[in-house]
């Protein structure tokens, strides 16, 4: 085959080699860029910057080699469009530093930086950590800082990510309140900071204020949906990024729903309870307190991480006709009480009018009028019966 006269020539089915001296000063408009998985660049003294726009359209790129060239600066977001990049060789260039942001989000199996005039500073603390932790083949390169000795010996005591403190209100927060959060940022070389509010949606009206080193956030007219939602403050410096998440507890009264009993490995009376703080629960059976046992007990489902509502069952492991009756769930927190009732019939009485039947659990009378509070919507409360042959 005739030698390729171009600056860049195909190499294999999806590779490109650019080795003709001084032919490139940027990576724009590389031929067949969208399908490239491998790009090898050498002897390009005029290629001094690598930026976001240079690698746009190289979404399939896995291996990138730029060696023996004039690379001085790699932008922090240079590899944003090459998420599959796994091998990066930038050896024998003019790089003095490389931001931690440049490699963030990539799963690099190999990073080669030998032969660069690196300048030891906190900005290379991340690279020193890679060396310590044996990542990306960095330890084998025994990287040196220009005129300063091995990277491994760089003092790092003062090289910390920012420190964040988020102040939340001590007092109880009620629905409709305005809440002011403040994020205090400390540390050297602070670059950027902000709030992540993706979980909030319709939970409040958001107003940001202030800037480094003190960021303010007002959550106006909060709703109960704000509970269990993360409000995150973040800050970055040349060493790395720090995040702190807080949650604002918005108080609201207890509510409860009961549903028709279902047979699920024995029996379950399903319920849902909500409220902040989490309400305490009590069951009544035919108006008397039901003391829970290993055969009649409350069992909660795994809670969703981002909501206050809890779902569960009153488990009746072996109900018979003596368990037929009216079940009431009482829920209470400092902001209100609620109750819901349902009739359940598990089995016909095979010993009709038999006074010998034991009471299955210990009961104590309760003043049911004490469960005052707003009425709660009750669903599926039609009584039902199931006949089961005994024996």
């Amino acid at each position: 085959a005739a030698p390729c006269p171009d600056a860049c020539c195909p190499h294999g089915s999806s590779g490109l080699r650019c080795t003709r001296d001084g032919a490139l000063d940027s990576l724009h408009h590389l031929p067949g860029a969208e399908n490239l998985t491998e790009l090898y660049i050498e002897n390009q003294q005029h290629l001094q910057h690598l930026e976001l726009r240079d690698l746009r359209g190289l979404g399939e790129l896995r291996n990138l080699t730029i060696v023996k060239s004039g690379l001085r600066f790699v932008a922090p977001d240079a590899f944003h469009f090459t998420p599959r990049l796994s091998r990066l060789n930038l050896s024998f260039n003019a790089l003095e530093s490389l931001s931690w942001k440049t490699v963030q989000g990539l799963s690099l199996q190999e990073l080669v930086l030998s032969g660069n005039p690196l300048h030891c500073s906190c900005a290379l603390r991340w690279l020193q950590r890679w060396e310590e932790e044996g990542l990306g083949g960095v330890p084998e390169q025994k990287l040196q800082c220009h005129g300063q000795g091995p990277l491994a010996h760089m003092p790092n005591a003062s090289c910390g990510v920012p420190t964040l403190k988020v102040q939340v209100p001590n007092a109880s927060v009620d629905v409709g309140d305005d809440v002011l959060l403040r994020c205090q940022v400390e540390g050297r070389g602070l670059e950027q900071a902000g709030w992540i509010l993706t979980e909030l949606e319709q939970s409040a009206t958001v107003m940001k204020s202030g800037g480094l080193p003190s960021l303010g956030l007002t959550l106006a007219n909060v709703t109960s949906d704000l509970n269990r939602k993360n409000v995150t403050c973040w800050a970055e410096n040349d060493v790395g990024r720090a995040e702190v998440s807080v949650q604002v507890n918005v108080s609201f009264p207890a509510s409860v729903q009961l549903h028709t009993a279902v047979e699920m490995h024995h029996w379950c009376i399903p319920f849902s309870v909500d409220g902040q703080p989490a309400p305490s629960l009590r069951w009544l059976f035919n108006g008397s307190v039901l003391n829970e046992t290993s055969f009649i007990f409350t069992e909660f489902l795994e809670p969703a991480a981002n909501e206050t509502v809890r779902h569960g069952c009153l488990r009746l492991n072996q109900p018979t006709h003596v368990n037929n009756g009216n079940y009431t769930l009482l829920a209470a927190n400092p902001f209100g009480q609620a109750s819901a009732s349902i009739m359940a019939a598990f089995m016909d009485n095979p010993f009709e009018f038999n006074p010998e039947d034991p009471i299955p659990v210990s009961f104590s009378p309760v003043d049911t009028n004490s469960t005052s509070g707003d009425p709660v919507e009750k669903k599926d409360e039609t009584p039902f019966g199931v006949s089961v042959a005994v024996g």
Epitope: S294, E299, E356, I359
Partner: antibody, heavy 117, light 106 residues
Framework: QVQLVQSGAEVKKPGASVKVSCKSS????????MHWVRQAPGQGLEWMGE????????NYNEKFKNRVTMTVDISISTAYMELSRLRSDDTAVYYC??????????WGQGTTVTVSS | DVQLTQSPSSLSASVGDRVTITCSAS?????MHWYQQKPGKAPKRLIY???KLASGVPSRFSGSGSGTDYTLTISSLQPEDFATYFC?????????FGQGTRLEIK
Amino acid sequence: QVQLVQSGAEVKKPGASVKVSCKSSGYTFTNYWMHWVRQAPGQGLEWMGEIYPNNARVNYNEKFKNRVTMTVDISISTAYMELSRLRSDDTAVYYCARSRYDPMEDWGQGTTVTVSS
Amino acid sequence: DVQLTQSPSSLSASVGDRVTITCSASSSVGYMHWYQQKPGKAPKRLIYDTSKLASGVPSRFSGSGSGTDYTLTISSLQPEDFATYFCQQWSSIPLTFGQGTRLEIK
């Protein structure tokens, strides 16, 4: 697999207390009730009480109510049964057993407690 | 308390025999459960919810009954079946066991 491993044999004097442990593994400790059952030499099984690790709810057999205390440490998936003011007729093998939807599915190997002056 | 009375208290039988143990409750219970215990060992769940076989239990074991009267049947005794059997109720506190039926080789 599910295992309930109990603490070793104890010899106690009358009037003393004994605390037996039952370490669970192989299942979610907080989802199951733990029962304590004892068996005197050559005798039948006697239920002492039960505890629900999820909320530390306990039910005791009235016979032992003033002398028995059942507790759990969910951080190490362990249940405890302490019996105080021991008498010679408390000499027995003490078992833990777990239940959720069915009774006493799995049992510990037993802990022999001897009360003797 | 619900008292459970097993009969017989002890029983001699031969390999291959059909054996029946009964458990009578002082008041109605919804279900009965049965355990097998061998000397020096913890009890092992045999039958639960009156008639369900616990995992790994041979089909020669069966249970039946309702109300106050329940039965454990072994259709054809095997050498490993010689042990003590207990019934138990799980319907009211305190949970109670029968006094046991000792099954020995004739």
